[in-house]
Amino acid sequence: YHGCPSECTCSRASQVECTGARIVAVPTPLPWNAMSLQILNTHITELNESPFLNISALIALRIEKNELSRITPGAFRNLGSLRYLSLANNKLQVLPIGLFQGLDSLESLLLSSNQLLQIQPAHFSQCSNLKELQLHGNHLEYIPDGAFDHLVGLTKLNLGKNSLTHISPRVFQHLGNLQVLRLYENRLTDIPMGTFDGLVNLQELALQQNQIGLLSPGLFHNNHNLQRLYLSNNHISQLPPSVFMQLPQLNRLTLFGNSLKELSPGIFGPMPNLRELWLYDNHISSLPDNVFSNLRQLQVLILSRNQISFISPGAFNGLTELRELSLHTNALQDLDGNVFRMLANLQNISLQNNRLRQLPGNIFANVNGLMAIQLQNNQLENLPLGIFDHLGKLCELRLYDNPWRCDSDILPLRNWLLLNQPRLGTDTVPVCFSPANVRGQSLIIINVNVAVPSVHVPEVPSYPETPWYPDTPSYPDTTSVSSTTELTSPVEDYTDLTTIQVTDDRSVWGMTQAQSG
């Protein structure tokens, strides 16, 4: 292997790996034909002049998870073939000017998870072939104009998890090839108009977890190729009417965890490729007609944990492909009978944790494919005759934690529930709340003769005697039939795993303790 230092392992494929706390300097001699060198988890604190001078064929160099705090400007001299350089997860506070000089082939430069306080235009002025620059997880407070001007071939730039409070509108102006820009987890309060105008090939823009309060109306108007836009966990209180107008390629948009109070009709669109829209944890109080009408391909709409008390009958117009609708944990008291009429493909609807007092008999009239309805923790005392009769695929119905009134009016519902018990699950069945003499008794097995008779007798004697079982032979008891979208917040899927933070918050979409164990 042309000589391999004792602290390292060398493979036939010209790969050298040096790891361990006993290493305090770059091991020597390194095999002259090495093409990949990894120095990981050592106690190296500095890189002196030209430690890699004799391995000029090196293509990839990873110096990660060390104690590295100082680098001499000539440390990477003679590495003209180097394409990949990672100095991630060290303790660098300062980069010497000229450090990357001569690295004419460099395509990927990873400086993430250090303690860098600033970058300057001179740092990267020689890196004209750079395609990927990772600077996330440092202490950068500002980016000077010109810092990236020479990186015209850059396709991926990660500035997330820094301390940026503002961005100059000129800082990205020469990055016409950039496809991914990540600015998440900073302290940005606003983004000047024109900041992204030069980014005509941008496909992903990550702005989540900042303190952005306002979006300029034309902020994204030049980003026609944008596919993923992350705006969650900011302080956005309103959306300018045209802000999303020029994003025809968008397939993921996250707006959860903001301060949105209202959504104006047509605000989203046209976005023919958008499949999911996450709006939970805002302050939305009402939904007007046609607010989502441009989202013809939308399959998942999450509106939970808002303050919605009114939904206009045409609010969901156009959502013919919608599969999952989450409205739980809002302030709904009443629903119009036609509100879900257009949702012909709806499979799961979660309405729990509202204040629903009654439901119109035709509320699910056109939604024949419903498989799961969550109505627990509302103020329902009874349900209209035949409300679920046509729902042949229904296999999960949650009705517990409602104050069911077990007088003679409850008989039709009781009879239907008796015939359709598997749909309720075994964990929590609905129980009577009134009258007091039957409180706590199961609604399904209640002897209504004991209950106080109703003042008015229902015209139709009971629900149909034939149970409308789903096609499948067995029914879930405690597991939800809903897809996994129900269980988690959207994972903002990045290639570099360090940025992924899955929030397995079952309450976001609808799972309660009783269902998820």
């Epitope: 302050h283 109080s285 944990r305 303050q307 008390s309 944990t329 302030a331 008291q333 729990q352 944790n353 204040r355 627990q376 923790n377 509302n378 103020q379 517990y400 934690d401 409602n402 104050p403 929590t428 129980v431 009577c432 709340f433 409180r439 706590g440 309660t512 303790q513 009783a514 269902q515």
Partner: antibody, heavy 121, light 107 residues
């Protein structure tokens, strides 16, 4: 008659844990939502958490999310509040309260006498 | 949602008509209750859903309002009414109390 009896309070160091209990009697426990409300010495009322009749729905005030857990044992007619990572600002009298209905509402018609939690080093 | 009660305290005589207001930072429909608390005691529910009188509470207590502005009125103050009064909204999580209004005896 309805009775709610809290227990489990006491002196604990910052970062420590306590488990409060509330024994209920005189009503059909499982058909009423229950809540914890606290009151720091000389201060106003502060809602902490609520749990629905079955225990299927739980909610918390922001300052205790991730640290406190409300639960109930309907077979034992007991409400619990598990408190971890306690801070000085959690010092208060903790009341358990019975809601007027099974679903989570903020209208409490019966209250316990309270148990004092003191977080101090 | 922030609840602001006014006044923070007031002095009145037996027989007086007393009005306490509670203003919310956002519209909460009628999802508001009023509680009375005496020193060293647990609170007592007076009014729920902004205007419904809780069972067993004297009819001199009444509540009104909707949206953001709510009022608790004691039509003729009695000796046992000297206490601190709190409003609570349960429209939106987290539920929040007002800071309280102390009703004291006028000397």
């Amino acid at each position: 008659q309805v009775q709610l009896l809290e227990s489990g309070g006491g002196l604990v160091q910052p970062g420590g844990s306590l488990r409060l209990s509330c024994a209920a009697s005189g009503f059909t426990f499982s058909t009423f939502a229950m809540s914890w409300v606290r009151q720091a010495p000389g201060k106003g009322l502060d809602w902490v958490s609520v749990i629905s009749g079955t225990g299927g729905s739980t909610f918390y005030t922001d300052s205790v999310k991730g640290r406190f857990t409300i639960s109930r044992d309907n077979s034992e007619n007991t409400l619990y509040l598990e408190m971890n990572s306690l801070r000085a600002e959690d010092t208060a009298v903790y009341f358990c309260a019975k809601a007027v209905t099974v679903n989570t509402r903020g209208f409490f018609d019966y209250w316990g006498q309270g148990t004092l939690v003191t977080v101090s080093s | 949602i922030v609840l602001t009660q006014s006044p923070s305290s007031l002095s009145a005589s037996v027989g007086d008509r007393v009005t306490i207001t509670c203003r919310t930072s956002q519209v909460i429909r009628n999802d508001l209750g009023w509680y009375q608390q005496k020193p060293g005691k647990a609170p007592k529910l007076l009014i729920y859903d902004a205007s419904s009188l809780q069972s067993g509470v004297p009819s001199r207590f009444s509540g009104s309002g909707s949206g953001t502005d709510f009022t608790l009125t004691i039509s003729s103050l009695q000796p046992e009414d000297f206490a601190t009064y709190y409003c609570l909204q349960d429209n939106n999580y987290p539920w929040t109390f007002g800071q309280g209004t102390k009703v004291a005896i006028k000397r």
